[in-house]
């Protein structure tokens, strides 16, 4: 039996850059059973990840991963050196950021240790796999009666980021959303100051430096209201 | 072995114009941005402008937003910059850059663009 499977995931080129490979096999056997897909993801460009869901082999299975990077000068195949575990079974592995090459096509191999010739390949464009942390130190600035402006801080270089904005009022059931680009700035024309506002903000990996389809975690909530009473309609910000 | 050679700086008066390019050899250009750095007299290394691999998305510093203009030439496994309305506080030393402009790897030597009237 022997298969190839094209898996697009939304990291496709002109030619797929996510596939996976098992190796022939002479009879109907273990060896004849898909491994778990790998799923790598590369946090804020410091480590990366790459998982699998160990509890889909049908029994408790220590796979193994090897790596390289393809027509590159980082062409030698590795060993994982840090496993993540399950249960005491490896479902990963964490490479640091001296072995992460954005640019360069990342193949990666799973490995049944006990049925060599069962493995899986895949090649990943980890440029589109990148995962910042969200935005911190979120601020609020009073430019005029009734505008506002809103910053914040990404630990990593802006240009290469853009952002989503949601905010609301107490009184509205959902988020309004606002897409803005690597400048990072915000602002809101018309303020209502009888209503207290949230804001919050999230960030993604795209599209100067990478296609990344996955945003981060969403900042922590930033508030700006007005104490009810009439008499004194100050505005105030308070962080959560 | 990677290699970046920029040229096209001058001297130049205040609202003067320059083109400034930057061959790159040894490593896969189109796959990677590429960044525009310069550096003036005692300071340290500025960002001015990344572009994205197929040139579809560009990025510039609020200092040339506007009088810049960065562009690539995948063909020719080139960078540009375009520097339009130029200021005496553009006088620097233009360094291009592999990637996205983290400061690694070392650009190449610069090409010198002196403002002055």
């Known amino acids: 039996l022997n298969t190839t499977i094209l898996t697009p995931n939304g990291n496709e080129d002109t030619t797929a850059d996510f596939f996976l490979t098992t190796m022939p096999t002479d009879s109907l056997s273990v060896s004849t059973l898909p491994l778990p897909e790998v799923q790598c993801f590369v946090f804020n460009v410091e480590y990366m990840n790459c998982t699998w869901n160990s509890s889909s082999e049908p029994q408790p299975t220590n796979l193994t991963l090897h790596y390289w990077y393809k027509n590159s000068d980082n062409d030698k195949v590795q060993k994982c050196s840090h496993y993540l575990f399950s249960e005491e079974i490896t479902s990963g592995c964490q490479l640091q950021k001296k072995e992460i090459h954005l640019y360069q096509t990342f193949v990666v191999q799973l490995q049944d240790p006990r049925e060599p010739r069962r493995q899986a390949t895949q090649m990943l464009k980890l440029q589109n796999l990148v995962i910042p942390w969200a935005p911190e130190n979120l601020t609020l600035h009073k430019l005029s009666e009734s505008q506002l402006e809103l910053n914040w801080n990404n630990r990593f270089l802006n240009h290469c980021l853009e952002h989503l904005v949601q905010y609301r009022t107490d009184w509205d059931h959902s988020w309004t959303e606002q897409s803005v680009d690597y400048r990072h700035k915000f602002s809101l024309p018309s303020v209502d100051g009888q209503k207290r506002y949230t804001f919050r903000v999230r960030s993604r990996f795209n599209p100067l430096c990478g296609s990344a389809q996955h945003w981060s975690e969403w900042s922590h909530p930033i508030h700006w209201g007005s104490n009810t009473s009439k008499e004194n309609p100050f505005l105030f910000a308070l962080e959560a | 072995q990677v290699q970046l050679q920029e040229s096209g700086g001058g001297l130049v008066q205040p609202g003067g114009s320059l083109r400034l390019s930057c061959a790159a050899s040894?490593?896969?250009?189109?796959?990677?941005?590429m960044t525009w750095a310069r550096q003036a007299p005692g300071k340290g290394l500025e960002w001015v402008s990344t572009?994205?691999?197929?040139?579809?998305?560009?990025a510039y510093a609020a200092s040339v937003e506007g009088r810049f203009t960065i562009s690539r030439d995948n063909a020719k496994s080139t960078l540009y910059l375009q520097l339009n309305s130029l200021k005496t506080e553009d006088t620097a030393m233009y360094y291009c850059?592999?990637?996205?402009?983290?400061?690694?790897?070392?650009p190449g030597q610069g090409t010198q663009v002196t403002v002055s009237s």
């Open positions: 850059t592999k990637g996205y402009g983290d400061g690694t790897p070392a």
């Open positions: 040894g490593f896969s250009f189109s796959s990677y941005p």
């Open positions: 572009i994205a691999s197929d040139g579809g998305s560009t």
